[in-house]
Interface confidence: low
C-alpha cells in the first residue's frame, strides 16, 4: 500500500508524459490523477516506466475501478496488462476483439500466462460462444489453445483456423479432440494435392476413421511410425497387412519395434499369422493358421 | 462399396431447364466431395460444379456459372444439378462424381445423358 502524502508544489500532473518518468513512487501517487490517467492510458505505452512505477499507476486505476476497469481503458493497458492478476482480470467485461487483440498482442511470443487464459475465459463467455474472429484472433496467437478447448467448443471451431496450426501444438490434444478437429484439417487442406496433403493433415490423423486411413495406404503417403502409433486403435484394427505395409512404405519394419505397444499389439492380434509372416519380420501373434474368425461385434450390435 | 446412380436426363430444347440428381450410398457421403461432370462426344470429362459435403461451399467454371446451380440433400443422399438457360453446347453425358479429398473425383455414377437441340 502506498502511503498517502501530498502532492508537492508544481508537481501535479496536467498530462501523462514523459516528464513522470523521474517522479518517485510517492509522487507518482500524489501527483497522477486517476481519472487523468484512464483517459491518457494510451501514453503509458510510450513511457519507460519502472516496474514499480506501473505498480503505482495500476494502484491508482484500482482505486479509481474497485468493480472492474471499463473496456475504454482495459484497451489501453499495454504493458501494464502484464502487472494484472487472474483475480483482476475477472473483474472485467471484455466485448472488443480489438481490445483482446490489444492485450495478446503485450503477451505475444510468450507462453500463454494464466492471465491471458483468463481474459480469453472472459472475452469468450462474454460474446457468449466461439466466433469465427474470436477463433482466429486466438489461434494466431495460441495455435495451442485448441488443446485446451472441450470437443464440444472445438465443434464451433471453423476449418479456416486450422491453417495456423503447427504440428506441435497437437501435442496436447487428446483423441477426442483429434475426433473433432480431424474432419475440420481434412475440409482445410482438401484442395491440397496428395502429397502436400498428407503433410499437413499428419498431425491430426489421431481422429481419422478406418476408411481414410485405407485410402492413404493407396496414395503412396509412407507414414512415419511416430504418427502410426498416434492413430486410434479403432481405426487401425479393420486394417489389413497389405494396407498397412502400403500405408507406411519402407517405415513398415519398424512395427518390430512397436510390436508390444498398441496399436500395433492389438492390431497384431486381429491378422492371420500366415498374413504377417508375409511382411518378413518375424512379427508374432497373429491368429493361427487353420482357425475361423468370427467378428461378434456385429452380432453385439444387434442384440 | 460407393455407388453413385444419376438420373434426370433427357432431350430439351435450347433455353430450357433440366434437374439431375444423384443418389449417394456408402461411407462417402458424409465426408467427400460431390461433383458433376459432363464427357462430350470426341471430348475430355469437364467438372462442371462441386459442392464440398461439410460446409457445402460450390464451385462453377465459367461456362456454367450463374446457369448450373449445384444443391444437396443430407437427409436423402442426394446431390442435384439444376441447369437452367440450356445450349446445345450443354449436350453432353452428365457424371456424377464422389472425390476423396487427397486423390481427386475417384468414384464415378454411369452417367447420364443430357441433349439440348431444337
Known amino acids: 500500500e502506498v502511503e498517502k502524502t501530498a502532492c508537492p508544489s508544481g508537481k501535479k500532473a496536467r498530462e501523462i508524459d514523459e516528464s513522470l518518468i523521474f517522479y518517485k513512487k510517492w509522487e507518482l501517487e500524489a501527483c497522477v490523477d486517476a481519472a487523468l490517467l484512464a483517459t491518457q492510458m494510451d501514453r503509458v505505452n510510450a513511457i519507460p516506466f519502472t516496474y514499480e512505477q506501473l505498480d503505482v499507476l495500476k494502484h491508482k486505476l484500482d482505486e479509481l475501478y474497485p468493480q472492474g476497469y471499463p473496456e475504454s481503458v482495459i484497451q489501453h493497458l499495454g504493458y501494464l496488462f502484464l502487472k494484472m492478476s487472474p483475480e483482476d482480470i475477472r473483474k472485467w467485461n471484455v466485448t472488443s476483439l480489438e481490445t483482446l487483440k490489444a492485450l495478446l498482442e503485450v503477451n505475444k511470443g510468450h507462453e500463454m500466462s494464466p492471465q491471458v487464459a483468463t481474459l480469453i475465459d472472459r472475452f469468450v463467455k462474454g460474446r457468449g460462444q466461439l466466433d469465427k474472429d474470436t477463433l482466429d484472433t486466438l489461434t494466431a496467437f495460441y495455435p495451442g489453445y485448441l488443446c485446451s478447448l472441450s470437443p464440444e467448443e472445438l465443434s464451433s471451431v471453423p476449418p479456416s483456423s486450422i491453417w495456423a496450426v503447427r504440428p506441435q501444438d497437437l501435442d496436447t490434444c487428446d483423441p477426442r479432440q483429434l475426433d473433432v478437429l480431424y474432419p475440420k484439417a481434412r475440409l482445410a487442406f482438401q484442395n491440397m494435392n496428395g502429397s502436400e496433403y498428407f503433410v499437413k493433415i499428419q498431425s491430426f490423423l489421431g481422429g481419422a476413421p478406418t476408411e481414410d486411413l485405407k485410402a492413404l495406404s493407396q496414395q503412396n503417403v509412407s507414414m512415419d511410425l511416430a504418427t502410426f502409433m498416434k492413430l486410434r486403435t479403432d481405426a487401425v484394427l479393420p486394417l489389413t497387412v497389405a494396407e498397412v505395409q502400403k500405408l507406411l512404405g519402407p517405415h513398415v519394419e519398424g512395427l518390430k519395434a512397436e510390436e508390444r505397444h498398441r496399436p500395433v499389439r492389438d492390431w497384431i492380434l486381429r491378422q492371420r499369422q500366415d498374413d504377417l509372416d508375409t511382411l518378413g519380420l518375424g512379427l508374432q501373434g497373429g491368429i493361427p493358421n487353420g482357425y475361423l474368425v468370427l467378428d461378434l461385434s456385429m452380432q453385439e450390435a444387434l442384440s | 462399396e460407393v455407388q453413385l446412380v444419376e438420373s434426370g436426363g433427357g432431350l430439351v430444347q435450347p433455353g430450357g431447364s433440366l434437374r439431375l440428381s444423384c443418389a449417394a450410398s456408402g461411407y462417402i457421403y458424409g465426408f467427400y466431395a460431390m461433383g458433376w461432370f459432363r464427357q462430350a462426344p470426341g471430348k475430355g470429362r469437364e467438372l462442371v460444379a462441386s459442392?464440398?459435403?461439410?460446409?457445402?461451399?460450390?464451385y462453377y467454371p465459367d461456362s456454367v456459372e450463374g446457369r448450373f446451380t449445384i444443391s444437396r440433400d443430407n437427409a436423402k443422399r442426394m446431390v442435384y444439378l439444376q441447369m437452367n438457360s440450356l445450349r446445345a453446347e450443354d449436350t453432353a453425358v452428365y457424371y456424377c462424381?464422389?472425390?476423396?479429398?487427397?486423390?481427386?473425383?475417384?468414384?464415378w455414377g454411369q452417367g447420364t445423358q443430357v441433349t439440348v437441340s431444337s
Open positions: 459442392i464440398n459435403s461439410i460446409d457445402s461451399i460450390t
Open positions: 462424381a464422389a472425390r476423396y479429398i487427397a486423390a481427386g473425383f475417384g468414384y
